[in-house]
């Protein structure tokens, strides 16, 4: 069976600032079990978007319906674009792990770039 | 807290259908799965049937796919299990069963018994 | 199928572990679920291998490896006499699936 991969299509998204962005993820399997979680960023210094999982991201909704045991459509779309939201993000896969899941596979990423408000 | 409250058991005879219900508060009931799982006398646990939050995605166990059909109202803050054809295997306890993020169970109704006898 | 021990018994504040096999390890999740009584309703003592919801008691852990789950309880105590069921969802199958059942007897 084919090794998960983890398509990010677009490299780059330019959205006006006050809108919403949307950032495209597909898994081409759903093996191994366990999270996504999208970061802005690279690295020891990523800040977390979204993680499947847990927690509370108020300004993040998943484009697909995340509770479809079928799902491979980890796309999300940020809402209220400010400028401080430019940079790349990265959809990520994690494999489970006790007592910590392990990144499996990483996106190539999505710079997004924030356009100043139409006026 | 969160409440699932299971409704619509009772005794029938085989071959006559049930409509089994359970009433979720206490959560945001149109963010989760939901599964049903039943018990019969003297038995173990058994998962019947799920749906996706939004509920157009359904998954059953083989044995009762074609004559059980799990469904759910968010307006109504509702999950339901129609079963048909009813025989002396089907008497069970039956509970509802919120699902986590990854299709497992975290919060349990107290059941509903349904009881085929002739 | 999911396999684990029909019986298990320990006496008060002893370690018991409870194993559940027969899944794979990178397309399962398990759980496990304390009954006390057949018949009413199951009680979440932990889900995704190891995560403990909030209000049981930190004497219950769980962990996977291999095509293996396992349930330690530590420090026993009578009041945790039950059923524990292990269960497991199947990321190939998208099926759920239940071990018979563990009874635990404390001493």
């Known amino acids: 069976e084919d090794e998960l991969q983890v398509i990010q299509p677009e490299k780059s998204v330019s959205v006006a600032a006050g809108e919403s962005a949307t950032l495209r993820c597909a898994m081409t399997s759903l093996i191994p079990v366990g999270p996504i979680m999208w970061f802005r960023g690279a690295g020891a210094g990523r800040e977390l978007i979204y993680n499947q999982k847990e927690g509370h991201f108020p300004r993040v909704t998943t484009v697909s319906e995340l509770t479809k045991r079928n799902n491979l459509d980890f796309s999300i779309s940020i809402s209220n674009i400010t400028p401080a939201d430019a940079g790349t993000y990265y959809c990520v896969k994690f494999r489970k792990g006790s007592p910590d899941d392990v990144e499996f596979k990483s996106g190539a990423g999505t710079e997004l770039s924030v356009r100043a408000k139409p006026s | 807290d969160v409440q699932l409250v299971e409704s619509g058991g009772g005794v029938v005879r085989p071959g006559e259908s049930l409509r089994l219900s359970c009433a979720a508060s206490?959560?945001?009931?149109?963010?989760?799965?939901m599964s049903w799982v039943r018990q019969a006398p003297g038995k173990g646990l058994e998962w019947l049937a799920g749906?996706?939050?939004?509920?157009?995605?359904?998954y059953y166990i083989d044995s009762v796919k074609g004559r059980f059909t799990i469904s759910r109202d968010n307006s109504k803050n509702s999950l339901y299990l129609q079963v048909n054809s009813l025989t002396a295997e089907d008497t069970a306890v039956y509970y509802c069963?919120?699902?986590?993020?990854?299709?497992?169970?975290?919060?349990w109704g107290l059941g509903t018994l349904v009881t085929v006898s002739s | 199928a999911l396999t684990q021990p029909a019986s298990v018994s320990a006496n008060p504040g002893e370690t018991v572990k409870i194993t559940c096999s027969g899944g794979?390890?990178?397309?399962?999740?398990y759980g496990w679920y304390q009954q006390k009584s057949p018949g009413s309703a199951p009680v979440t003592v932990i889900h995704s291998d190891d995560k403990r919801p909030s209000d049981i008691p930190s004497r219950f852990s769980g962990s996977a490896s291999g095509s293996a789950a396992t349930l330690t309880i530590t420090g026993v105590r009578v009041e945790d006499e039950a059923v524990y069921y292990c269960?497991?969802?199947?990321?190939?199958?998208?099926?759920?699936?239940f071990g018979a059942g563990t009874t635990l007897t404390v001493l």
């Open positions: 269960a497991g969802y199947d990321g190939r199958t998208y099926i759920n699936t």
């Open positions: 069963a919120r699902e986590t993020w990854n299709h497992l169970f975290d919060y």
């Open positions: 794979g390890y990178y397309s399962t999740y």
């Open positions: 749906i996706s939050a939004g509920g157009s995605d359904t």
């Open positions: 206490g959560f945001t009931f149109s963010s989760y799965a």
